[in-house]
Interface confidence: medium
């Protein structure tokens, strides 16, 4: 019968000929009366056999990631009779893995959106690298993830590639972050190869800023001839938030005379001071009113950012009109 052990050849061997093992018949007494032959894909080009001894050699550099095993056939012939000594047999040469592939992130580019002020531990995104090396061969394809850029705001779980928030972030200070993640094979041991990816993390706005008046004092004038409903001027607050989180409503906080009103222009986010009752210079030639401004939409959990609405004082001078 045939005698052989399992055949392994390391990939990427640079020698011109690498001895893999020996195929022989147990009828071979070593007197060179048998001839061994190799058949199948790779026979003669990738692998050769010593016809006399049955020793098999790899004569080409192999790449396991291209082809991890070769199925060949062996024959042994009695030189004197030309007959097969053993039935033709199939055998396998396995290409054994070396760590010659770095981890690669295949789903690049990564981009994630997370609300600002999210608590520590909030999941942002999972990045996954793949390694073409053999996962069953030692640690060649066992990966560890680490953060190269992004501290102290982000962390990555070493074995899963899950990125989490590790420190609260304020969109109004910085609205996006570039995080660089490294994946290292060999679980980080010497000889490890690595790959990196960038993750763009954008912060979405939450309503964590209240509107604040640009001025603590506004000065307006109104003619005593102005009819009710006249717009006598505008006031403006600013809000560091964006979108609907920056929409605001103006109102009168204090006007003992009940002479003025404030309406909100929702397109410009300005407050328009309106004359509610006609004024008379001879009766009262100036007024002081206090206005306040609040956001339109404030979720309950964000009310803590909106205590004490911003207020401003408006000095309104009545202009005299000569009466006939």
């Amino acid at each position: 019968g045939w005698v052989w052990n399992q055949f392994f050849v390391p990939e990427e061997m640079n020698t011109t000929s690498h001895h893999i093992g020996q195929l022989r018949s147990d009828l071979d007494n070593g007197n060179n009366s048998f001839q061994y032959k190799l058949l199948g894909a790779g026979a003669g080009s990738t692998f050769i056999i010593d016809e006399r001894t049955g020793d098999i050699y790899a004569i080409q550099k192999l790449d396991r990631e291209e082809r991890s095993l070769y199925i060949l056939r062996a024959q042994v012939i009695d030189i004197a009779t030309g007959r097969a000594v053993e039935p033709e047999s199939e055998f396998v040469i396995k290409v054994s893995d070396i760590n010659d592939n770095e981890p690669k992130f295949l789903d690049e580019p990564y981009e994630a959106i997370v609300p600002e002020m999210s608590p520590e531990g909030t999941l942002v995104i999972q990045v996954t690298a793949s390694d073409a090396d053999d996962p069953s061969s030692g640690n060649n394809a066992r990966l560890l993830y680490s953060l190269l850029q992004g501290q102290p705001y982000f962390s990555v779980e070493p074995t899963t590639g899950v990125i989490r928030i590790s420190s609260k972030m304020d969109r109004e200070l910085q609205d996006e972050y570039w995080v660089i993640i490294q994946a290292k094979d060999m679980i980080g041991q010497p000889g490890a190869l690595s790959g990196t990816t960038s993750v763009l993390i954008k912060l979405s706005d939450v309503n964590d800023n209240k509107p604040i008046f640009k001025e603590s004092l506004y000065r307006l004038t109104v003619s005593e001839s102005a009819p009710t409903g006249t717009s006598i001027g505008t006031i403006m607050a600013y809000d560091n938030d964006i979108g609907e989180n920056a929409e605001m409503d103006y109102s009168i906080e204090e006007d003992d005379s009940q002479t003025f009103d404030i309406i909100t222009n929702h397109e410009t986010q300005e407050g328009i001071v309106i004359l509610k009752k006609k004024v008379d210079f001879e009766h009262q030639n100036h007024y002081g009113i206090r206005a306040k401004v609040k956001n339109h939409h404030v979720p309950e959990q964000l009310m803590k950012y909106h205590t004490e609405a911003s207020t401003t004082f408006i000095k309104i001078q009545v202009e005299d009109v000569d009466e006939p």
Partner: antibody, heavy 119, light 107 residues
């Protein structure tokens, strides 16, 4: 030091003119409305005129309207009162005063300059 | 214009005593826009109270203001030697007018 210092007062004949100045220091002059207030032994304290922080609006007491002009130079932190066609009843100590941001009361006054109108 | 009338014209008191000064307006003062000033001889007026009852910065708490509409009061709870002066009320709800003053003198 936050202060207002008036100057330019003196003795003048009726019908003549005088220009008062008020030098401000120690605060952001260009942010405040400024007023002139005068004090006579007979009438007590009397408001004279106001000018808004940027000079855009000016208002006067009926007793001086058309004769007095209030102005300011924010680059020099100075308030002025040009007094024309002076009358005997304009005799008074003239104070410049700073209006607060919230309302029309005066939180800072100068020490005053005396104007005497006499023939 | 709104006329402010202060009473009494003169108040003779000793240090440590309580002083109560009155200011009455000829018509209602809107939004309690009333201030009190102290003036000593040769000096400029000094703001004590605004908004009828709010103490200005640096004013001791022995000074207090009250009132609304047409009747306002300045109270000095315990007179100190430096409190003897002339006190003026001012309305700033419609133009600016002052009372004629109340002199607080040492008895």
């Amino acid at each position: 030091q936050v202060q207002l210092v008036e100057s330019g007062g003196g003795v003048v004949q009726p019908g003549r003119s005088l220009r008062l100045s008020c030098a401000a220091s120690g605060f952001s002059f260009s942010s405040y409305d400024m007023d002139w207030v005068r004090q006579t032994p007979g009438k007590g304290l009397e408001w004279v005129a106001v000018i808004w922080y940027d000079g855009s609006n000016k208002y006067y007491a009926d007793s001086v309207r058309g004769r007095f002009t209030i102005s300011r130079d924010n680059s020099k932190n100075t308030l002025f009162l040009q007094m024309n066609s002076l009358r005997v009843e304009d005799t008074a100590v003239y104070y410049c005063a700073r209006e607060t941001g919230e309302g029309w009361y005066f939180d800072l006054w100068g020490r005053g300059t005396l104007v005497t109108v006499s023939s | 214009e709104i006329v402010l009338t202060q009473s009494p014209g003169t108040l003779s008191l000793s240090p440590g005593e309580r002083a109560t000064l009155s200011c009455r307006a000829s018509q209602s003062v809107s939004s309690s826009y009333l201030a009190w000033y102290q003036q000593k001889p040769g000096q400029a007026p000094r703001l004590l109270i605004y908004g009828a009852s709010s103490r200005a910065t640096g004013i001791p708490d022995r000074f207090s203001g009250s009132g609304s509409g047409t009747d306002f009061t300045l109270t000095i709870s315990r007179l100190e030697p430096e409190d003897f002066a002339v006190y003026y009320c001012q309305q700033y709800g419609s133009s600016w007018t002052f009372g004629q003053g109340t002199k607080v003198e040492i008895k």
